[in-house]
């Protein structure tokens, strides 16, 4: 192990230098380990499982946004192995608080039961 090598680097025995770990393609995540000077002989990249995605590199697969369950929004674009889901307008019975600052997830829809009078998404 070479402690001078970075998080995503291994010690190349041939050159004696730190070398970048091979990055994974979008839709894949690293399997086994590479970094801080060492690389498993069988290090590789495996596909993201269902409901997860990765932009590649050294990123692990992350779960798609749950538009309906968490955001109470419609699904504009379902996620795949390479892309997160994109959420659309609120589900029926929910409305968007436009003046709220976005949280780390983006906009969240709130129940019309909590809506101020005459909220357009909740009228009718």
């Amino acid at each position: 192990e070479d402690s001078n090598c970075g998080e995503n680097e291994y010690h190349n025995q041939t050159t004696g230098l730190c070398q970048q770990c091979p990055p994974c393609r979008p839709g894949e995540e690293p399997y086994m380990s590479c970094g801080y000077g060492t690389k498993d002989d069988d290090y590789g990249c495996v596909p993201c499982p269902a409901e997860k995605f990765s932009k590649g590199g050294y990123q692990i697969c992350r779960r798609h946004k749950d538009c309906e369950g968490f955001f109470r929004a419609t699904v504009l674009t379902p996620g795949d192995m390479e892309n997160d889901a994109e959420c659309g307008p609120c589900l029926p019975g929910y409305y968007m608080l436009e003046n709220r600052p976005r949280n780390i997830y983006g906009m969240v829809c709130y129940s019309c039961l909590l809506a101020p009078p005459n909220t357009k998404e909740c009228v009718g």
């Epitope: 069988d42 590789g44 990249c45 495996v46 499982p49 269902a50």
Partner: antibody, heavy 119, light 107 residues
Framework: EVPLEESGGGLVKPGGSRKLSCAAS????????MHWVRQAPEKGLEWVAY????????YYADTVKGRFTISRDNAKSTLFLQMTSLRSEDTAMYYC????????????WGAGTTVTVSS | DIQMTQSTSSLSASLGDRVTISCRAS??????LNWYQQRPDGTVKLLIY???RSQSGVPSRFSGSGSGTDYSLTISNLEQEDVATYFC?????????FGGGTKLEIK
Amino acid sequence: EVPLEESGGGLVKPGGSRKLSCAASGFTFSDYGMHWVRQAPEKGLEWVAYISSGSSAIYYADTVKGRFTISRDNAKSTLFLQMTSLRSEDTAMYYCARREILRYYFDVWGAGTTVTVSS
Amino acid sequence: DIQMTQSTSSLSASLGDRVTISCRASQDISNNLNWYQQRPDGTVKLLIYYTSRSQSGVPSRFSGSGSGTDYSLTISNLEQEDVATYFCHQGKTLPYTFGGGTKLEIK
């Protein structure tokens, strides 16, 4: 040019031994993990053994463990399968196959060599 | 070990047909599913890797899909040269295992 070429097959008596070879060309052999896969007559494919690029990781199917030995000579770009205590059920076409770099599948296959175990 | 099952051992279709070959794993293999074509002369070739990705040089009429335990290979416009046996393979866990194969013939 054929990237993988197996040799060493033939007729062997039960209990006998045989060494198969797989000559690689047209790519940097030492960069790739390699597998042996076999196919009994009129049957499906069966994974037999794997050796990583630097020989630090070696795995066998339970059906051949203790009887078969996979090895490689990176300087000669050659993969080997030493088979001992052969049984009739080892009769098959034996393929060597390359593991794609960073991936867990076989991206290039040889044409195969036939081993027949019979008295 | 993970068992791979190809429920159809042989099928016959006409030129130009759309053909789907299915494969089921005994447990979730997280899209680590590959498809191989074995021609009548014994030649084996990788078609699709990691469920849906085409190996370079493979005609676009071959496509793959699925997730979890259920996967399929589709040939959208059957040609004479597609006469072969098709095998699925899981690369998730050693020992690697294959389906029993589906032999495709032309009517």
